[in-house]
């Protein structure tokens, strides 16, 4: 479940998967940093399919994807990276 | 030994429907992503659609969505792709064939025999 | 959609030949392409994956280059197997093959 809209909840993840999910299916990704009155930081998976899912940040796919994307981000991504900047 | 054996290919009249089954063995089923790939007659290969392990998660191609649904019976081994409105140009071989596992691994590399679909008046 | 663009779309060689196939990408696929290796009347197997590991019992002559939107596969000395039809694959967004590339006997 998630909550995918600004809503009063302080977190927007309400439950985490870890299972992988290949790249060329997916659309982008939202990172949310810790802050804003939400203790821990959040992963926001776009699927190609239009459906949604928070991963577990700590699941080491996720962890190995963003880290191949941050060494490609100079060049252009299939897979657009978000980070919100929280005011 | 790992084989993908595909079943429930034939002729099929414009608007008709049909149920392709793969039946797997020799490796762990759920622990693959699973897709259908079509080749039309002495024609290139054509991706058609994808699932994930638990089948909780599905992808089309564009041309087939809302009319093709792909689903999985993890417990008794078999992929499926249920095929509505058929058109002439759905005519092909269907194969079923194996993605990454749920490590994202390309250790295997499995296809079926292929089924062929005839849309045909 | 990534559209992959494959050359040439027919080959005559001989035994011993060298041979390179082409694909080129719509846009950037990092080096997330596949090789396939077809024969009539039989399922696609594959040969190469992310664009220049072998596949475990594929031969050694076969290699895969490139990065970004180009890309070749090579094969060194052709045998008599090789004789076949030839597809890449882009899986960066979704799935793209290319049209094919049909190696024949010269």
């Known amino acids: 479940v998630l909550e995918v809209y600004y809503t009063s909840l302080r977190c927007r993840c309400v439950q985490e998967s870890s299972v992988f999910i290949p790249r060329r299916f997916i659309d982008r990704i939202q990172i949310l940093p810790r802050g804003n009155g939400c203790p821990r930081k959040e992963i926001i998976v776009w699927k190609k399919n239009k459906s949604i899912v928070c991963v577990d940040p700590q699941a080491e796919w996720i962890q190995r994807m963003m880290e191949v994307l941050r060494k490609r981000s100079s060049s252009t991504l299939p897979v657009p990276v978000f980070k919100r900047k929280i005011p | 030994e790992v084989q993908l054996v595909e079943s429930g290919g034939g002729l099929v009249q414009p608007g008709g429907s049909l149920r392709l089954s793969c039946a797997v063995s020799?490796?762990?089923?759920?622990?693959?992503?699973m897709a259908w790939v079509r080749q039309a007659p002495g024609k290139g290969l054509e991706w058609v659609a994808s699932?994930?392990?638990?089948?909780?998660?599905?992808y089309y191609r564009d041309s087939v969505k809302g009319r093709f649904t792909v689903s999985r019976d993890n417990a008794k081994n078999s992929l499926y792709l249920q095929m509505n409105s058929l058109r002439a140009e759905d005519t092909a071989v269907y194969y079923c064939?194996?993605?990454?596992?749920?490590?994202?691994?390309?250790?295997?590399?499995?296809w079926g025999q292929g089924a062929l679909v005839t849309v045909s008046s | 959609d990534i559209q992959m663009t494959q050359s040439p779309s027919s080959l005559s060689a001989s035994v011993g030949d060298r041979v390179t196939i082409t694909c080129k990408a719509s846009q950037n696929i990092n080096k997330e392409l596949t090789w396939y290796q077809q024969k009539p009347g039989k399922a696609p197997k594959r040969l190469i994956y992310n664009t220049n590991i072998l596949q475990t019992g594929v031969p050694s002559r076969f290699s895969g280059s490139g990065s970004g939107t180009e890309f070749t596969l090579t094969i060194s000395s052709l045998q008599p197997e090789d004789f076949a039809t030839y597809f890449c694959l882009q899986q960066s967004s979704l799935y793209t093959f290319g049209q094919g590339t049909k190696l024949e006997i010269k």
């Open positions: 699932i994930n392990y638990d089948g909780g998660d599905t």
């Open positions: 020799g490796f762990t089923f759920s622990d693959y992503y």
């Open positions: 064939a194996t993605e990454e596992d749920y490590d994202g691994s390309y250790v295997m590399d499995a």
